[in-house]
């Protein structure tokens, strides 16, 4: 696993503890909360990041709590169970033995149940719609410039291949970024769209997960793009299973 050998830190995840105890004295970094070794040349999985976030002491937390109106995966933050690869386990339970099934981005996709609840597989989120509202500007951004800048950002900051950025829509002041990545399209080593979306979401909130790198400075032809609202919608390869009571609520 990689990290800067001179000062032994993890460029892609500041919520790690790093020490030169890898093979040959190489720097190795482990995620807070889980203690799992992470690959610092790429994004850390959302599951490990959520676990690290929940393990941070409340009084030492440097992250801004979302307001009561913020939409955070419907159910808010929770301490997830991650598999040995750092992915979300299909079934998540809290300390009071309430359980539910989640998709590959950790969002609940069934009603809550008890310990007898079965989640047969981790259902892949293959389509993510990131809905942004930008602050007022003198004029609308040029759509093609905005499109190019957002694709460049996802490529160069999150290492997400542009083939997974399906579209960028713009109707001032709303920007929609569509990420698509089917199971069959995702090759070994490809960044997961769920992880890229999570890093982007945290960047937009001013809570960058990157170590020692400036926060997100989004500009379109030199004009700052300042986001004032973010909503993220997740579509799974298999539709979620909620009761009619929830659907009509």
């Amino acid at each position: 696993h990689t990290a800067a050998q001179d000062n032994c830190t993890c460029p892609t995840n500041k919520m790690t503890v790093c020490s030169p105890d890898g093979p040959g004295g190489r720097c190795q970094c482990r995620a807070l909360g889980s203690g799992m070794a992470v690959d610092c040349s790429t994004l850390t999985s959302k599951c490990l990041l959520l676990k690290a976030r929940m393990s941070a002491p409340k009084n030492a937390r440097t992250l801004v709590r979302p307001s009561e109106h913020a939409l955070v995966d419907n159910d808010g933050l929770y301490d997830p169970d991650c598999d040995p690869e750092g992915r979300f386990k299909a079934r998540q339970c809290n300390q009071t033995s309430v359980c539910w099934c989640v998709n590959s981005v950790g969002v609940r996709r069934t009603d809550k149940g008890d310990l007898s609840l079965r989640c047969d597989e981790l259902v892949r989120t293959h389509h993510i719609l990131i809905d942004l509202r930008h602050r007022p500007t003198a004029g609308a951004f040029n759509h093609s410039d905005l499109d190019a800048e957002l694709r460049r950002l996802f490529r160069e900051r999150y290492r997400l291949h542009p083939k997974f950025v399906a579209a960028v829509h713009y109707e001032q002041p709303t920007i929609q970024i569509e990420l698509r990545q089917n199971t069959s399209q995702k090759a070994a080593g490809d960044v997961d769209i769920g992880d890229a979306a999570y890093y982007f979401e945290r960047d937009i909130k001013g809570e960058s997960l990157f170590q020692g790198r400036g926060g997100l400075d989004l500009r379109v032809r030199g004009e700052p793009l300042q986001v004032e609202r973010t909503l993220i919608y997740y579509l799974d390869e298999i539709p979620p299973k909620f009761s009619m009571k929830r659907l009509t609520a």
Partner: antibody, heavy 119, light 108 residues
């Protein structure tokens, strides 16, 4: 077998524009690869100029960005380089290359074309 | 920009020798490093990508290792065809692509 072939004038006048084209065979320019230009001044090392994706996304070396334009012609399965305001320092062997990965490493190269800037 | 520094600049060796070329990055680049071989009058040829993955068709005597800021290319048993100039290249996400200055491998 993927092949790349550079073409264009071998001599350009100072302050003029260097224009080169790279014809791609054995792969579609619309595949999920990057199409790059790299140059090498005589007896020196390699310098990345910039690259393009089939959708038109470009990325340029900041040291050359103000003078460079890379474009793609999907109908002809080729891509092109334009470098403005050239000087003798731009004399080099110019290579086109296919970039693999999200950020490019270069798995296929053209044989190169020497461009001399001189009056 | 990330600077890539290769050492040595020139290396003299004999057929059958084991040789090592080093490449250092000015900041951590993870394992996003490639190695190329270039012969006079020819285009570079990809040998190694992602620091240690051998490109298809490249002889197994070539190997790469390292991560972060320090990388090595090793040729386990030098063959006559291996005398050439070798370049490293970083392709980290957060910087323009840059190459090392090259290492010329010559016959002793």
């Amino acid at each position: 077998q993927v092949q790349l072939q550079e073409s264009g004038p071998g001599l350009v006048k100072p302050s003029g524009t260097l224009s080169l084209t790279c014809a791609v065979s054995g792969d579609s320019i619309s595949s999920h690869n990057w199409w790059s230009w790299v140059r090498q001044p005589p007896g020196k090392g390699l310098e990345w100029i910039g690259e393009i994706y089939h959708s038109g996304i470009t990325s340029y070396n900041p040291s050359l960005k103000s003078r460079v334009t890379i474009s793609v012609d999907k109908s002809k399965n080729q891509f092109s380089l334009k470098l403005n305001s050239v000087t003798a320092a731009d004399t080099a062997m110019y290579y086109c290359a296919r970039g693999s990965g999200v950020i490019s490493y270069f798995d296929y190269w053209g044989q190169g074309t020497l461009v001399t800037v001189s009056s | 920009d990330i600077q890539m520094t290769q050492s040595p600049s020139t290396l003299s060796a004999s057929v059958g020798d084991r040789v090592t070329i080093t490449c250092r990055a000015s900041q951590s680049i993870g394992n996003w490093l490639a190695w190329y071989q270039q012969k006079p009058g020819k285009a570079p040829k990809l040998l190694i990508y992602k620091a240690s993955s051998l490109e298809s068709g490249v002889p197994s005597r070539f190997s790469g290792s390292g991560s972060g800021t320090e990388f090595t290319l090793t040729i386990s048993s030098l063959q006559p065809d291996d005398f050439a100039t070798y370049y490293c290249q970083q392709y980290d996400s957060y910087s323009p692509i840059t190459f090392g200055q090259g290492t010329r491998l010559e016959i002793k």
